[in-house]
Amino acid sequence: QQQTLPKPFIWAEPHFMVPKEKQVTICCQGNYGAVEYQLHFEGSLFAVDRPKPPERINKVKFYIPDMNSRMAGQYSCIYRVGELWSEPSNLLDLVVTEMYDTPTLSVHPGPEVISGEKVTFYCRLDTATSMFLLLKEGRSSHVQRGYGKVQAEFPLGPVTTAHRGTYRCFGSYNNHAWSFPSEPVKLLVTGDIENTSLAPEDPTFPADTWGTYLLTTETGLQKDHALWDHTAQNLLR
């Protein structure tokens, strides 16, 4: 006899990185017929939703109108059908950005390099932080962590055309509170003609994942679809 229901899916719209004072929606998708959903934050009950009519709804949305550091952290959700509760969802790491200051991102030997050259990014922030994050636009929101008192270095090693793209960095005050993003640095990697022509534009970040984050940052615009990114989420853990 089944003691629990399958776990629901949880994600943030438009993005798990939320500029402070902007809005975000946490979505939880369970099963049709669920009479109650609970959203938990850092182990405590955060919010409840009872869909109506339950037999026609399999997803609820929890709205956070005003993101701040108190709401940054790990969320999970559960749902109930009758008296039977589900397993908890995976953890959603909700990050507040635009805290305090803006780091400076630079690249050595420069933004235009030849395939095979060693490239290092430097992220500098003079306020009290020791963890830095380097993000590259593309399909998987690739996040690298670096450590240092005011500056972290991110050696990419010998680069290939797959390293081409736009990079930004953040200072991290804790796992869930990040600085403003740095200005972007576009890395151009040239190889021999044959390799370059065959190399696709690096697909490491959904085309509109970063764009959606920037829209949220600049205008508060919300997009009503999931841009859930497991790679970046897992790297937060």
């Epitope: 009950l45 869909p51 929890f62 709401m71």
Partner: nanobody, 126 residues
Framework: EVQLVESGGGEVQPGGSLRLSCAAS????????MGWFRQAPGKGREFVAA???????YYAESVKGRFTISRDNAKNTLYLQMSSLRAEDTAVYYC????????????????????WGQGTLVTVKP
Amino acid sequence: EVQLVESGGGEVQPGGSLRLSCAASGRTFASAAMGWFRQAPGKGREFVAAISRSDDTYYAESVKGRFTISRDNAKNTLYLQMSSLRAEDTAVYYCAAVVPTYGNNIYVHSAAYNYWGQGTLVTVKP
């Protein structure tokens, strides 16, 4: 901008009743999820009850069956009817709002609320 003003607090004997009110300014009351929290002397702020825009309610276990939360959107007012009061209910009671929100969202965690009143004191003693 939402302003919340609580009233109705006072001194009452154990087993007695009180009704707290929270008057909200502005036209956003109907689009707000609302809640009551309390803070006893020397303790942290504690969730009491909450209500969604669509009148779904949720209660702390310690007040379930004794307290009732309700709202009157026409009057921009939130209520907390308290009965069978106990000494441990003595606290400053705060009204809070989440604006805006979805219709069925009920918020339990204090971090979710973006507007707060100044509080009204409820004292339960013989």
